[in-house]
Interface confidence: low
Amino acid sequence: EVEKTACPSGKKAPEIDESLIFYKKWELEACVDAALLATQMDRVNAIPFTYEQLDVLKHKLDELYPQGYPESVIQHLGYLFLKMSPEDIRKWNVTSLETLKALLEVNKGHEMSPQVATLIDRFVKGRGQLDKDTLDTLTAFYPGYLCSLSPEELSSVPPSSIWAVRPQDLDTCDPRQLDVLYPKARLAFQNMNGSEYFVKIQSFLGGAPTEDLKALSQQNVSMDLATFMKLRTDAVLPLTVAEVQKLLGPHVEGLKAEERHRPVRDWILRQRQDDLDTLGLGLQG
């Protein structure tokens, strides 16, 4: 902590400007009014302060707002955000998407830090749910964000938000997460016609039950093998050979290449050899 010293004569800062980069740490502490700093936070980012100087500015804001910064200050923190601890951020009440975007921009290109994770958590909890605009923003900055959430957290995603999800956002999701997301996707996309519906629902099918796979098999969807391999084993096992053939369409030949991998291996073992032979792929049960 910087020792309290009186501001030298003529050094009192009338505004936040570049002249402050020549101030020593103790001078910043003594000569910059915290309330002035709070109202002119947007200028801090344009001034090349050292990390040590930023520490002083943060300290001044902490003293002014011991219960947590107001959003008007948070939105303009810029690089000062990198100085915040998760404990600091837990005191904040961030409700504006613009504030969230501004702070995520500061961390852009880096892995999600504990600070960012805490910020997102505070923001989402403040909103009460992970709405479409928020999800759009978060997945743009962190494509793996959705799959970093627990199934319990995902349950707060309303179906309308699913429209913001891109296939790559689900790449690292495990089956438990897809179990939560799939029903929401079904509801979100339900009024689309068959072919459009399949394009949208495809990435979520790792959470689909057997009944829905059976239904899809009646709709000429031609599921690719990559999607088929991500289906739940317990959902695939009850499918008949005819249903899998209809589901995969021309991609059915790919089963041969995957016959030793789940869920194909387990599915083959459940089928009658006579039925497998109708595929003409030499699959052995």
Partner: antibody
Amino acid sequence: EVHLQQSGPELVKPGASVRIPCKASGYTFTDYNMDWVKQSHGKSLEWIGDINPDNGGTIYTQKFKGKATLTVDKSSSTAYMELRSLTSEDTAVYYCARRLHYYGSSGLDYWGQGTTLTVSS
Amino acid sequence: DIQMTQSPASLSAYVGETVTITCRASGNIHNYLAWYQQKQGKSPQLLVYNAKTLADGVPSRFSGSGSGTQYSLKINSLQPEDFGSYYCQHFWSTVWTFGGGTKLEIK
């Protein structure tokens, strides 16, 4: 606890319109479709249509196109069915019912208590 | 639209008996079928969904079975509270029709 609260009995004149509310509580309103079902006295159940409260998308049976209009008010978690150009044929009990799970899963797991509509001059 | 034909239209049975109600669809409905019970003057209650899954709180004496176009609801060891009307409903195509109903009466 999930609850669907419908309004009391309605007596309306032929040619008039009526709007029946169904207030949902105990769950996230936008996460489940709401279906509407008609039951004439001593008869079977008749599916009218459904609405997706999240985006307002509706599906109606052919018979009820032009007769029924389904809407929702998300702010009050209330679904509505408006019936227009009423005749004695529309005299029945009308139920709202929540669709089990999501689109494609088969079942209406919670039902309102029903609104009795009587069309008579 | 797919039509649902339910039989029998009415049925009398003793307490303790086993009864079966059937529903035939005019096309393959791929297990997208529900069964409901309705008591006089009350709302229907879901018993079975996806053809064979018991809804929460439904006693195990109820069971659903079938596939393709033929489905049935079986009630083992009938209890006094089981009497009422039963309906099937399909959810396969866009328009989800109900069967005509079966009235189960006490002998």
